[in-house]
């Protein structure tokens, strides 16, 4: 799969493949994988992809299920790239404060915060 | 500050304190702090709080600016707790796939994805 495919298209295709292969994937009844308790998904990318790795190692490969795991690995690559961009640019305090304000604003409005 | 204060109220108060103390905080003209290039904030919590630590170490403490940094450390504590909850519960493959589908769905609709 060329990495040139836009990430948004990759995510859409992966959702479809996940649906298609659900029956095959859940065949292993003894396998247990960590599942986050909350819905702040971005905080849990590491655990999600560790889980995907566990699932892949237990799944018979071939056909489009292989494409599913290939897609998921490209999505991981994209997220790793985004994580790298968290710390690459050293800016002045004014810009950091504007970003921090945005971050807290997003926490305030969009995060799923338990009381 | 009691940790019993709901996180949502803590975030609101911190936003107000950030506004109040902006002038004092930007006084250091030579300090540089990593600022993420994108707006997928949850991916960057580690770098954001490292930046806050850098800023705190360079800021004269006292009065309500101290409260600002105390609040920020409580917010960090909350986020660290959320991160711990990413891997605590081991579930069946079906539940993991449901979470993965939700994660990809959120990526598809809410993440800021560059072409």
């Amino acid at each position: 799969i060329p990495t040139e495919i836009p990430t948004s298209a990759l995510v859409k295709e992966t959702l479809a493949l996940l649906s298609t292969h659900r029956t095959l994937l859940i065949a292993n009844e003894t396998l247990r994988i960590p599942v986050p308790v909350h819905k702040n998904h971005q905080l849990c990318t590491e655990e999600i992809f560790q889980g995907i790795g566990t699932l892949e190692s237990q799944t018979v490969q071939g056909g489009t299920v292989e494409r599913l795991f290939k897609n998921l690995s490209l999505i991981k690559k994209y997220i790793d790239g985004q994580k790298k961009k968290c710390g690459e640019e050293r800016r002045r305090v004014a810009q950091f404060l504007d970003y921090l304000q945005e971050f807290l604003g997003v926490m305030n409005t969009e995060w799923i915060i338990e009381s | 500050i009691p940790t019993e204060i709901p996180t949502s109220a803590l975030v609101k108060e911190t936003l107000a304190l950030l506004s109040t103390h902006r002038t004092l905080l930007i006084a250091n003209e030579t300090l540089r702090i990593p600022v993420p290039v994108h707006k997928n904030h949850q991916l960057c919590t580690e770098e954001i709080f490292q930046g806050i630590g850098t800023l705190e170490s360079q800021t004269v403490q006292g009065g309500t600016v101290e409260r600002l940094f105390k609040n920020l450390s409580l917010i960090k504590k909350y986020i660290d707790g959320q991160k711990k909850k990413c891997g605590e519960e081991r579930r069946r493959v079906a539940q993991f796939l449901d979470y993965l589908q939700e994660f990809l769905g959120v990526m598809n609709t809410e993440w800021i994805i560059e072409s």
């Epitope: 002045r92 504007d98 304000q101 604003g105 | -």
Partner: antibody, heavy 119, light 107 residues
Framework: QVQLVQSGAEVKKPGASVKVSCKAS????????INWVRQAPGQGLEWIGY????????RYNQKFKGRATLTVDKSTSTAYMELSSLRSEDTAVYYC????????????WGQGTLVTVSS | DIQMTQSPSSLSASVGDRVTITCKAS??????LSWIQQKPGKAPKTLIH???RLIDGVPSRFSGSGSGQDFTLTISSLQPEDFATYYC?????????FGQGTKVEIK
């Protein structure tokens, strides 16, 4: 493709206000800051300020603080720059420009709006 | 505010010439500098960002260098479509500030 389309030319009297619009298309409006820059006839470029459509937060060049107001309408993906108490020195072409990332370079510019202040 | 001093303010050159424009910041701006091209009656266009990174679609004859306070824009072999005014912009600190511009004219 990514575009910023600005409103048409305006003629205003001294003391009046002007509101210039900048309609974004081809990308998710809330993902990028919008900057405003002006250029007086035969002169260089001058930064007015930026607005973050994500949270409506704006920052201004001190020179324009109190006179310039930056706003956005997320429902129409449009940014606005209003300048009040106009004087002849405000005669200029006003540009909107998109930040590539947070406090980053301007990767897309609007075509410009000429504002003429004359009695 | 950070002052950006550009030189020369204008220059005459021929097609094929190598052209260099410099920009000096009044304080350290790291590498947060872009170079912008503007043709008469047209909107500005960013050519280079972060001092030396060429923007997609910009011809490779344009290059930038420098960090800290001193920066350079070079056009290795001037083409007819390159006759324009060039500005440097620092986006390191608020307020962002531009150089006064360098007009590149045909000799």
């Amino acid at each position: 493709q990514v575009q910023l389309v600005q409103s048409g030319a305006e003629v205003k009297k001294p003391g009046a206000s002007v509101k210039v619009s900048c309609k974004a298309s081809g990308y998710t409006f809330t993902n990028h800051h919008i900057n405003w820059v002006r250029q007086a006839p035969g002169q260089g470029l001058e930064w007015i300020g930026y607005i973050n459509p994500y949270n409506d937060y704006s920052r201004y060049n001190q020179k324009f603080k109190g006179r310039a107001t930056l706003t956005v309408d997320k429902s129409t993906s449009t940014a606005y720059m209003e300048l009040s108490s106009l004087r002849s020195e405000d005669t200029a072409v006003y540009y909107c420009a998109r930040d590539y990332g947070n406090f980053w370079y301007f990767d897309v510019w609007g075509q410009g709006t000429l504002v003429t202040v004359s009695s | 505010d950070i002052q950006m001093t550009q030189s020369p303010s204008s220059l005459s050159a021929s097609v094929g010439d190598r052209v260099t424009i410099t920009c000096k910041a009044s304080q350290d701006i790291n590498s947060y500098l872009s170079w912008i091209q503007q043709k008469p009656g047209k909107a500005p266009k960013t050519l280079i960002h972060r001092a030396d990174r060429l923007i997609d679609g910009v011809p490779s004859r344009f290059s930038g260098s420098g960090s800290g306070q001193d920066f350079t824009l070079t056009i290795s072999s001037l083409q007819p479509e390159d006759f324009a005014t060039y500005y440097c912009l620092q986006y390191d600190d608020f307020p962002y500030t531009f150089g006064q511009g360098t007009k590149v004219e045909i000799k």
